[in-house]
Interface confidence: low
């Protein structure tokens, strides 16, 4: 018969596993099996026989099973024996990588690679690699005879660098029992390297400065280098040395700072492996408050006005105010203080207010004083121009330029100009100490001419206080000159004529030159010499004239400068009528008597009177004086018909009478033949 074993001759078993060794026969129906170790030590297993097979089960395998096991099969009288060498090992887990601490760039670190429960160690090899680089390899040959499960380690110390980030540490353990392929003889552990950098180069930037004023603000920004990026923590050092946490942000902003905010501020950059701090000292200084006085360091105030002086404080929350004059005279004003402003109202401003006023501000234990000079002036109205009379060409006139209620007088200048020409200038330099409102005048006399008309007479008053700010510093009044010219060259135009027929119309136009344009006045001279005003129109029109309209008419040109007149005689002619032809003393006289033959035309002036004596041989024109013909010592031949013709441009009228001359001798009348 034959004997066979499974496995055939060698079994590699891992401690703790269950191992079965099988022994079987062929060619023997009822074999008898027995198992023993080569050195007759305990089997440390359980045998089960079944027919032609015997199984030795060792569960679990331990060091007590590391023997050469012999199976003996007895078939009747024959014995067969076959051995199986049981070898044990232990390699149950992957290695473990341990770091002595976090990987900090630049700081040495120990890497420990441990392989637990290994047997046999003399077959163990551990390799430690960083990336592809073998850092260390170790075999454990020294303790070959010890039968125990042990943890074997390999340690390497190295200094990480930034470039190690992302690399892997590989711990590879090999148990050199690889005669049989089925046993995993290599185990490994992998660890990715995370290299840290402890915070360093912590920097604080302070804006605007570490020296600050009360009420100001500061922004402090902190940065720190490290891996991972450090977290930033701001704290303040308290008097007892403790830190008071302020913020977990890189930027710390402190606003409306007070003096108690002075101190040391700490910025700490913190990451997993360390911290780094930087300190900065902030000094909050008491804010230098400022005082402003308005309207300015000096103010020009017009007497009678209301003036408000304002004292304003910046940089002090609750100031106290006081006002005084530089010479500690009464304030003569009303003070009102509220918050950071105080006002002193002087109303109305008078001479007693001409001082330097001081505003004293107290803030805490500090005092500040600001002054304002109140300078007075009075220059309320424009100058007044007055003249002694109207301006008449060639006649002198006195111009007065009056500036009312002026102060200070010593700064006043008055100037009189005609057009661009300065006529007079005066400065009032005296009276410097007088504190009163005065009226000041400039007077001058000049002779106006026609050419001055239309020119401006300017009175300019200047108050020379340029160092005071007020408007106006200059006032002026202007008067346009109109120089009067007395009427002259007065003329009358009569249309159609000054001699007219009764019933016709006449226009009499009067022209007179002067400035201002003369007013025209038409009058008629009455027989008693008085003037009867007729019209103020330049043209006097008479319609349907009558003889009574005849007479002397006067045209008068009148203006402020004088008057000028022109006379015109108007003659209204009518056809002669009411002719009277008389003989005086009678129409019948004696020879030798004196006879006056008189012809009158009572209603018509300007007629020609023609006296004639009619005769057969022809008429004789008699020389008459004013229509009267005197026959001295009448003769008989003087008897006859006398004719009077009253004649003018318009017409004529005849009258006749018969003169009878009686002879003295025979008392006969003599009649001239008709």
């Amino acid at each position: 018969f034959k004997i066979e074993t499974t496995p055939e001759s060698r079994y590699l078993a891992q401690i703790g596993d269950s191992v079965s060794l099988t022994c079987s026969t062929t060619g023997c129906e009822s074999p008898f099996f027995s198992w023993r170790t080569q050195i007759d030590s305990p089997l440390n297993g359980k045998v089960t026989n079944e027919g032609t097979t015997s199984t030795l089960t060792m569960n679990p395998v331990s060091f007590g099973n590391e023997h050469s096991y012999l199976c003996t099969a007895t078939c009747e009288s024959r014995k067969l024996e076959k051995g199986i060498q049981v070898e044990i090992y232990s390699f149950p887990k992957d290695p473990e990588i341990h770091l002595s601490g976090p990987l900090e760039a630049g700081k040495p670190i120990t890497v420990k690679c441990s392989v637990a429960d290994v047997y046999p160690f003399d077959r163990l090899e551990i390799d430690l690699l960083k990336g592809d680089h073998l850092m260390k390899s170790q075999e454990f040959l020294e303790d070959a005879d010890r039968k125990s499960l042990e943890t074997k380690s390999l340690e390497v110390t190295f200094t990480p660098v930034i470039e190690d980030i992302g690399k892997v540490l590989v711990c590879r353990a090999k148990l050199h029992i690889d005669e049989m392929d089925s046993v995993p003889t290599v185990r490994q552990a992998v660890k990715e390297l995370q290299v840290y950098i402890s915070p360093k180069n912590t920097v604080i930037s302070v804006n605007p400065s570490t020296k600050l004023q009360e009420g100001g603000s500061v922004t402090m920004t902190c940065s720190s280098e490290g891996l991972p990026a450090p977290e930033i923590f701001w704290s303040k050092k308290l008097d007892n040395g403790n830190l008071q946490h302020l913020s977990g942000n890189a930027t710390l902003t402190l606003i409306a700072m007070r003096m108690e905010d002075s101190g040391i501020y700490v910025c700490e950059g913190v990451n997993l492996i360390g911290k780094n701090r930087k300190e900065v000292e902030l000094i909050v200084q008491e804010k230098p408050f400022t005082v402003e006085i308005s309207p300015g360091p000096r103010i020009a105030a017009q007497i009678g006005d209301s003036v408000m002086l304002t004292c304003s404080v910046m940089g002090c929350e609750s100031p106290s105010f006081s006002w005084r004059t530089q010479i500690d005279s009464p304030l003569s004003g009303k003070v009102r203080s509220e918050g950071t402003n105080s006002t002193l109202t002087l109303s109305p401003v008078s001479f007693e207010n001409e001082h330097s006023y001081l505003c004293t501000v107290t803030c805490g234990h500090k005092k500040l004083e600001k002054g304002i000079q109140v300078e007075l002036y009075s220059f309320p109205r424009d100058p007044e121009i007055e003249m002694s009379g109207g301006l008449v060409n060639g006649s002198s006139v006195t111009v007065s330029c009056k500036v009312p209620s002026v102060y200070p007088l010593d700064r006043l200048e008055i100037e009189l100009l005609k057009g661009e020409t300065i006529l007079e200038n005066i400065e009032f330099l005296e009276d410097t100490d007088m504190k009163s409102l005065e009226n000041k005048s400039l007077e001058m006399t000049f002779i106006p001419t026609i050419e001055d008309t239309g020119k401006a007479l300017v009175c300019q008053a200047k108050l020379h206080i340029d160092d005071m700010e007020f408007e106006p510093k200059q006032r002026q009044s202007t008067q346009t000159l109109y120089v009067n010219v007395a009427p002259r060259d007065t003329t009358v135009l009569v249309s159609p004529s000054s001699i007219l027929e009764e019933g016709s119309s006449v226009n009499m136009t009067c022209l007179s030159q002067g400035f201002p344009a003369p007013k025209i006045l038409w009058s008629r001279q009455l027989p008693n010499g008085e003037l009867q005003p007729l019209s103020e129109n330049a043209t006097l029109t008479l319609i349907s004239t009558k003889m009574e309209d005849s007479g002397v008419y006067l045209c008068e040109g009148i203006n402020q400068a004088g008057r000028s007149r022109k006379e015109v005689e108007l003659i209204i002619q009518v056809t002669p009528k009411d002719i009277k032809l008389t003989a005086f003393p009678s129409e019948s006289v004696k020879e030798g008597d004196t006879v006056i033959i008189s012809c009158t035309c009572g209603n018509v002036p300007e007629t020609w009177i023609i006296l004639k004596k009619k005769a057969e041989t022809g008429d004789t024109v008699l020389k008459s004086i004013d229509g009267a013909y005197t026959i001295r010592k009448a003769q008989l031949k003087d008897a006859g018909v006398y004719e009077c013709e009253s004649k003018n441009k318009v017409g004529s009228q005849l009258r006749s009478l018969t003169l009878d001359v009686q002879g003295r001798e025979n008392n006969k009348d003599y009649f001239s033949p008709e």
Epitope: K236, Q244, L246, S247, G248, N249, T251, L252, T253, L254, I255, A256, M257, R258, E260, D261
Partner: nanobody, 125 residues
Amino acid sequence: QVQLQESGGGSVQAGGSLRLSCTASGFTYSSYYMSWVRQAPGKGLEWVSGINVDGSNTYYADSVKGRFTISRDNAKNTLYLQMNSLKSEDTALYYCATGSGRDSYDCYSGSWCPKGQGTQVTVSS
């Protein structure tokens, strides 16, 4: 205008508890760090506790660490301070205060800060 109204103060025996509340209005509460500060009789303002905008970071003075808890409810615009194991030295007027922005604690040392009228906490032994 920033308005803060504290409530929840009162008198309590040493070892007892109180919960203070502060209701905020007039500003975007959820954008500001918030603090609790207190003023003991005759003393200056003392910073007690602070919380960041979303409540993820809280900070405490050493004197209250482990006893007080700060929290906030941005939906209700409310800040809380849970005070446990109260001691007589916790007696003070408690104010809630806001910083000037999301990165600032202006009330860290009792300097300027918008704060409410305060709520009185009295702890008797």
